[in-house]
């Protein structure tokens, strides 16, 4: 799996999980989140050569097409596969509220 | 939806469905498929600015992050959303076989 266990341990130009820390206020303009101040969102990036973690038959076809037609702009792309929620704390007045924001953290990637 | 009805009628730099015809023999080196000789596979390409057909909260976060950090390589990517199968005819010896290859045709796209 193209997850932290594999990607953060190996130097990999191909599609893999990359670390990315996001500060809510500075990077997103989200002012209301009290805790955490930011989080490890991660992202997916890298080349998608033939058979590198292809998601579907179409992405396999596209990467094969791309090897024969490298000048074409048609090629698979490295995107998120497994995502996890993030629990946040914010306040309404003096009342603390806990909320779970879905699909906030990327755990693994694929070529799609 | 970023499908043929919308994308093939509009000139769109952002993420959209693009036409792509694939010739099995020439483009993939697949000599075993008798019919069809090729098919309209299509592909997804284009920019993913903030809120342009974002697939998940993470892709929204990433495109928003990208507006204030445009030099960062972290940005969502335009990939296939809905896929359809393709029916093919091939021969085993002189015996014709009909098979459905799943996820061969892209019908719409998303930013992921």
């Amino acid at each position: 799996a193209l997850d932290a266990a594999y990607c953060f341990r190996n130097v990999q130009d191909n599609c893999c999980l990359r670390p990315l820390y996001i500060d809510f206020k500075r990077d997103l303009g989200w002012k209301w989140i009290h805790e955490p101040k930011g989080y490890n969102a991660n992202f997916c990036a890298g080349a998608c050569p033939y058979l590198w973690s292809s998601d579907t038959q179409h992405s396999r076809v596209l990467s094969l097409y791309n090897t024969i037609n490298p000048e074409a702009s048609a090629s698979p792309c490295c995107v998120s596969q497994d995502l996890e929620p993030l629990t946040i704390l914010y306040y309404i007045g003096k009342t603390p509220k806990i909320e779970q924001l879905s699909n906030m953290i990327v755990k693994s990637c694929k070529c799609s | 939806a970023l499908d043929a009805a919308y994308c093939f009628r509009n000139v769109q730099d952002n993420c959209c469905l693009r036409p792509l015809y694939i010739d099995f023999k020439r483009d993939l080196g697949w000599k075993w498929i008798h019919e069809p000789k090729g098919y309209n596979a299509n592909f997804c390409a284009g920019a993913c600015p903030y809120l342009w057909s974002s697939d998940t909260q993470h892709s929204r976060v990433l495109s928003l992050y990208n507006t204030i950090n445009p030099e960062a390589s972290a940005s969502p990517c335009c990939v296939s959303q809905d896929l359809e199968p393709l029916t093919i005819l091939y021969y085993i010896g002189k015996t014709p076989k009909i098979e459905q290859l799943s996820n061969m045709i892209v019908k719409s796209c998303k930013c992921s």
Partner: antibody, heavy 121, light 110 residues
């Protein structure tokens, strides 16, 4: 504690104009500062914000490239890069209700009196 | 994103009556909402923040409520001094927005 805008005047289209908001009685380094404009007879239109601590800026999607915000220890500037007749309005600067991390999450409690910008050839 | 729709655009109310102004966000703003009052030729004045907290010096006849995407400002026992335009503002985010303010509601006191 007060805010005072200055620099509003009659300009010809395309002539850059800088508006200044001068703060008294508090430190700009602790507060989020915004610019909001109001065309005659129209509603409030947010232009952007400059954060107290980091100094990072956010602009309304329509305002990107048309306006630039910057600050010193006592002033916040708004540069209208190439004014058009659509930019004719009273320009207000506003301060976030809370200092520090709270910033402007609870709205703007302190406003200047506004400065009028007229664009005409 | 986070577009604010305010209704009605204008409302007439008798002295002593009650007026209700609604504000709808295009997505959840987690109670990050402020209300302002503006009289002609004057700067806006903060009335309510965090959807329901009264700003200092604001009379208790002003009441804010709501959560998620739906918010309400209620003015009860309306006085002549309440004739003004009222604006809501989402304060959840500054990122990727067009305008955090609603279009405004003019309150005419008879």
């Amino acid at each position: 504690q007060s805010l005072e805008e200055s620099g509003g005047r009659l300009v010809t289209p395309g002539t850059p104009l800088t508006l200044t908001c001068t703060a008294s009685g508090f430190s700009l380094s602790s507060y989020d500062m915004s610019w909001v404009r109001q065309a005659p007879g129209k509603g409030l239109e947010w232009i952007g914000i400059i954060y107290g601590g980091s100094g990072s800026t956010w602009y309304a999607s329509w305002a990107k490239g048309r306006f630039t915000m910057s600050k010193t220890s006592t002033t916040v500037d708004l540069k209208i890069t190439s004014p058009t007749t659509e930019d004719m309005a009273t320009y207000f600067c506003a301060r976030g209700r809370d200092g520090g991390a709270g910033g402007s999450r609870n709205g703007y409690s302190l406003w200047g009196q506004g400065t009028l910008v007229t664009v005409s050839s | 994103a986070y577009d604010m729709t305010q209704t009605p655009a204008s409302v007439e109310v008798a002295v002593g009556g009650t007026v209700t102004i609604k504000c709808q966000a295009s997505e959840s703003i987690y109670s990050g909402l402020a209300w302002y009052q503006q009289t002609p030729g004057q700067r806006p004045k903060l009335l309510i923040y965090a959807a329901s907290d009264l700003a200092s010096g604001v009379p208790s006849r002003f009441k804010g409520s709501g959560s998620g995407t739906e918010y309400t400002l209620t003015i009860s026992g309306v006085e002549c001094a309440d004739a003004a335009t009222y604006y809501c503002q989402q304060t959840w985010t500054d990122g990727g927005i067009d305008n955090p303010f609603g279009g405004g509601t003019e309150v005419v006191v008879k």
